[in-house]
């Protein structure tokens, strides 16, 4: 039978009576165009909705968009269009919500086109009142805050100008022209790069990594032959033009690029690209194209200086730039990632690795499931994750996989059972142990989302009728009731929870269709009196992440750590609380080869957990130098993975080897390192 | 082969304090829970709590919280279970038992290694 | 905490015969049930974990069945060692025990 629908399922018990006090209609007065929902600020319970219907006329397009907003988690909704003096907001925009709790909001509007510049409305009291602020220039991007200081705003302009604000949008000061891209940095520091000639599509490959840490009062040039950048983690990366091709390299700096140095990732040529998958303080994740439109390329896995990286998963799927991967961090256990291979056979298969990348293996098939008509054995196959890629083939997977960083060990997913992604009908199933195990969790594709810390899971079942029925399970997914929210059924658009996972509301979107009209409805569900109780001490219990055989001493041991966690039990019916805290306890293991990667110059080769030397460097081993200039490059062949604590145990020491190789590089030379100021 | 050892039988006054030791020799230690679960003369099973020797995480049973303490030494392989305020109806055998483990959870399996038990009377 | 009620809490059966206990949790246990063998001056056995797994080393002639809240542990042929009380255990919750089934010869 399929889950939840044997007889000796928990019973929630009385839940209709308690879900129907606590079910909240709002019908929105507006026609059914599009609509964008925004939480501002955390815990707060404030929700900004805004409506947007365009009617296309002959000459030109006509706008209309309405602003609602919600302080109790939606279950009311004000009309409040009239403090934006009903002017039409620019969706592509969005809603540029301010970082953390700071209340702030800007809103772009659209202008006629004589206008000298664009419109803005702010708000820094949670959308409370607006304040409209004419623009010098038509903004290309959205306001993007510092995350540092939520005051400090910049835009791109339509005509590449950089404007900075550091009175939150009051007022504008242009502090560069020809600018390309620009992000923030740390402490309220600004990267931007410019070009010199053409335009930023001519000039690309020559354009000028610039830095601002004073708010464009001072730059400083930190790069030139600049194809692209990006920050991830503490690392600075920038694509760079060779001198003799057209290829180009990863460079990266840990010091906000005062100093870079060259990755040692093979170079690549015009049509291929790089792309950081994944990035923290530790290390990087870096996927680098294959040659050819191929779908695929090679993820790479960093030391703790970002320079020195191993092979981690080859003929990973990701379709082109900028296009599709199905890379996934599960947020809900340390070092498990889940993403695509394409194999020879052109089919899509799931790896995931459970130590940060240093192995990937296919995802165990699930209990009492079978294999499906991929499968060449029926009893050996293997789950497979339906993510982007799927998305973006139509095929019908309405959500990517999703965890919670405070619902431990629980990932949910579209997935099919076989040798590879299949094309039918995909279900939906469940890990509580961040991928190590699955099983089917619902029949066929559904909306679903995690409440009050994995102490609720809620699902809409996905179809293309209207539907007034929510499913939920207060037992990570064993087993589920159904509630019917309403009884005149809506074509269903959306879930919306606020982001974090500790609230216990749930709003339902979409929209009611009649003979002349449609209009947009929302249904919000406060689960608050299914948990009736705070959970207690009894309620949890101990579990320990990463166990794979008790019987192995380093049991749990994921770089060079174990963790012991409360977990809530999956038949404690109660409420984890909005304050709620994941409780862990972590254990230092001892160190074994598995704790270091080979460094520059040495290998592991094929099982075999020792690092042994390259006899000779070849291509892009050869070309890696450190800083851009010759350099002594000592070493034993083994380095610490990052981010791994282990101690004592195993100490690999070898003969230290100085490695002198002639730098291929002239990315950065001293005289290029001029300061410049406004 | 896991074996749990439990130390002798122990004679106690009322009001006064027991603690029996439980050595597991032929096993990761470390990696189980231990818990504790009497028997007193012709009554049935209680569990009274349990310890999971790296961390020390210990929970114990409602009906003996504050009167129970449970320990475990990982460099001896030892666990340990101080029963205090001790009265007539805490005369039963005592014994530690091993919970078996297949996943992360460590209580959720059974047990599946017993010690011999040990025999605490209290009387006056 | 969750309650465990055992029932018979006496069972009179011959060699040969087919025997089922009864086990039943005051709140949903999913299927985290262990079943236990006792004899007399010895420390309890455990046969079934998982309501229906069977601890290795033990005779096939056990079997456990059930999840949520009703459980059953059935020997499918009694055999002259099996007389001895019978014990259930929760895991969902802070652990507890079934009352006991005590199977005797006829």
């Known amino acids: 039978s399929a889950p939840g629908e044997d007889e000796e399922c928990g019973r929630v018990r009385d839940f209709v009576a308690k879900l129907a006090n606590n079910t909240h209609q709002h019908v929105f007065d507006d026609l059914r165009g599009s609509v964008s929902l925004s939480w501002v600020g955390d815990s707060t319970g404030v929700i900004l909705v805004l409506t947007t219907f365009h009617v296309p006329l002959v000459i030109m397009t006509f706008g209309q968009s309405k602003l609602y907003r919600s302080e109790d988690y939606g279950k009311n909704f004000k009309d409040i269009t009239d403090l934006i003096n009903n002017t039409f907001i620019r969706t592509e925009f969005g809603m540029a919500i301010g970082p953390e709790n700071s209340g702030k909001v800007v809103l772009t509007a659209e202008v006629s086109g004589g206008s000298r510049g664009g419109r803005i409305f702010r708000s820094s009291d949670f959308a409370k009142n607006f304040v409209q602020t004419d623009l010098p220039f038509h903004p290309l991007t959205q306001m993007m805050y510092s995350p540092q200081n939520s005051d400090y705003l910049l835009a791109l302009s339509t005509e590449n100008g950089l404007w900075v604000s550091k009175n939150f949008g009051g007022k504008w000061e242009e502090i560069h022209k020809a600018v390309c891209l620009a992000k923030w940095g740390s402490d309220n520091t600004i990267f931007f790069t410019t070009y010199a000639n053409g335009s930023c599509k001519a000039d690309l490959g020559a354009l000028e990594l610039w830095r601002t840490s004073d708010l464009g009062k001072s730059f400083k040039t930190i790069g030139v032959k600049i194809y692209s950048f990006g920050l991830g983690g503490r690392f600075l990366f920038a694509s760079v033009m060779a001198d003799k091709d057209t290829t180009r390299r990863i460079h990266v700096s840990t010091d906000q690029g005062d100093t870079w140095s060259m990755a040692q990732l093979p170079s690549v040529g015009q049509e291929q690209f790089y792309s950081i998958l994944a990035a923290n303080d530790d290390m990087v994740f870096m996927h680098v194209d294959e040659p050819g439109d191929t779908g695929f390329g090679t993820i790479f896995t960093s030391d703790d200086r970002g320079i020195v990286y191993s092979k981690s998963l080859d003929r990973h799927l990701y379709t082109t730039t900028g296009g599709e991967t199905d890379f996934t961090n599960v947020t809900s256990l340390r070092g498990v990632y889940i993403t695509s291979v394409l194999s020879e056979d052109n089919s899509i298969q799931t790896m995931i690795t459970f130590d940060q990348g240093g192995r990937w293996t296919h995802l165990r098939k699930p209990e009492n499931s079978e294999c499906d008509a991929t499968a060449k054995n029926k009893n050996e196959c293997s789950l497979h994750i339906h993510a982007s890629y799927s998305i973006s083939q139509k095929l019908n997977v309405p959500m990517a996989p999703l965890s919670e960083p405070n619902a431990v060990g629980i990932v949910i997913a579209h997935g099919s059972v076989g040798d590879a992604i299949s094309v039918m009908v995909p279900d939906v199933y469940i890990s509580d142990d961040g991928g190590y195990s699955w099983t089917k969790m619902l029949e066929g594709p559904h909306y679903y989302t995690i409440l009050d810390s994995g102490g609720i899971i809620v699902a809409i079942e996905h179809s293309s009728r209207p539907i007034n029925v929510i499913k939920f399970s207060t037992d990570e997914g064993q087993c589920w009731q159904t509630y019917t929210f309403t009884r005149d059924p809506i074509y269903f658009t959306g879930l919306a929870s606020e982001p974090g996972a500790r609230s216990m509301n749930i709003s339902i979107w979409g929209f009611t269709e009649s003979f002349l009209t449609s209009q947009w409805v929302s249904y919000t569900i406060d689960f608050k009196d299914i948990l009736e109780r705070n959970c207690e001490e009894k309620d949890y219990t101990i579990w320990l992440a990463h166990s794979t055989d008790p019987e192995d001493y380093e049991d749990g041991c994921i770089l060079g750590y174990k963790e012991q966690f409360l977990r809530l039990r999956k038949s404690s019916v109660c409420q984890n609380g909005r304050d709620y805290v994941v409780t862990k306890q972590p254990s230092i293991c001892l160190c074994s080869l598995e704790d270091f990667l080979c460094d520059f110059g040495a290998y592991r080769p094929e099982n075999d957990s020792k690092c042994v030397e390259q006899p000779e460097l070849k291509g892009h081993d050869l070309e890696f130098c450190l800083y851009g200039r010759e350099e002594h490059l000592t070493t034993n062949g083994y380095r610490k993975i990052p981010g791994d604590k282990c101690q004592g145990g195993v100490n690999p020491v070898r003969e230290v080897k100085d490695l002198k190789k002639k730098c291929t590089s002239n990315f950065l030379s001293p005289e290029k390192q001029n300061s410049k100021s406004n | 082969q896991v074996q749990l050892v439990q130390s002798g039988a122990e004679v106690k006054k009322p009001g006064s304090s027991v603690k029996v030791s439980c050595k597991a020799s032929?096993?990761?230690?470390?990696?189980?829970?231990i818990s504790w679960v009497r028997q007193a003369p012709g009554q049935g099973l209680e569990w009274m709590g349990g310890?999971?020797?790296?961390?020390?995480?210990?929970n114990y049973a409602q009906k003996f919280q504050g009167r129970v303490t449970i320990t475990a030494d990982e460099s001896t392989s030892t666990a340990y279970m101080e029963l205090s305020s001790l009265r007539s109806e805490d005369t039963a055998v005592y014994y530690c038992?091993?919970?078996?483990?297949?996943?992360?959870?460590?209580?959720?399996?059974?047990?599946?290694?017993w010690g011999q038990g040990t025999t605490v009377t209290v009387s006056s | 905490d969750i309650q465990m009620t055992q029932s018979p809490s006496t069972l009179s059966a011959s060699v040969g015969d087919r025997v089922t206990i009864t086990c039943r949790a005051s709140?949903?246990?999913?299927?985290?049930l262990a079943w236990y063998q006792q004899k007399p001056g010895k420390a309890p056995k455990l046969l079934i974990y998982?309501?229906?797994s069977l601890e290795s080393g033990v005779p096939s002639r056990f079997s456990g069945s059930g999840s949520g809240t009703e459980f059953t542990l059935t020997i499918s042929s009694l055999q002259p060692d099996d007389f001895a009380t019978y014990y259930c255990?929760?895991?969902?919750?802070?652990?507890?025990f079934g009352g006991g089934t005590k199977v005797e010869i006829k």
């Open positions: 255990q929760q895991a969902d919750g802070h652990i507890t």
């Open positions: 038992a091993r919970q078996g483990r297949k996943t992360g959870y460590y209580y959720y399996y059974g047990m599946d290694v």
């Open positions: 032929g096993g990761t230690f470390r990696n189980y829970a």
């Open positions: 998982k309501a229906s």
């Open positions: 310890i999971i020797p790296i961390g020390g995480w210990a």
């Open positions: 709140q949903s246990i999913s299927s985290w």
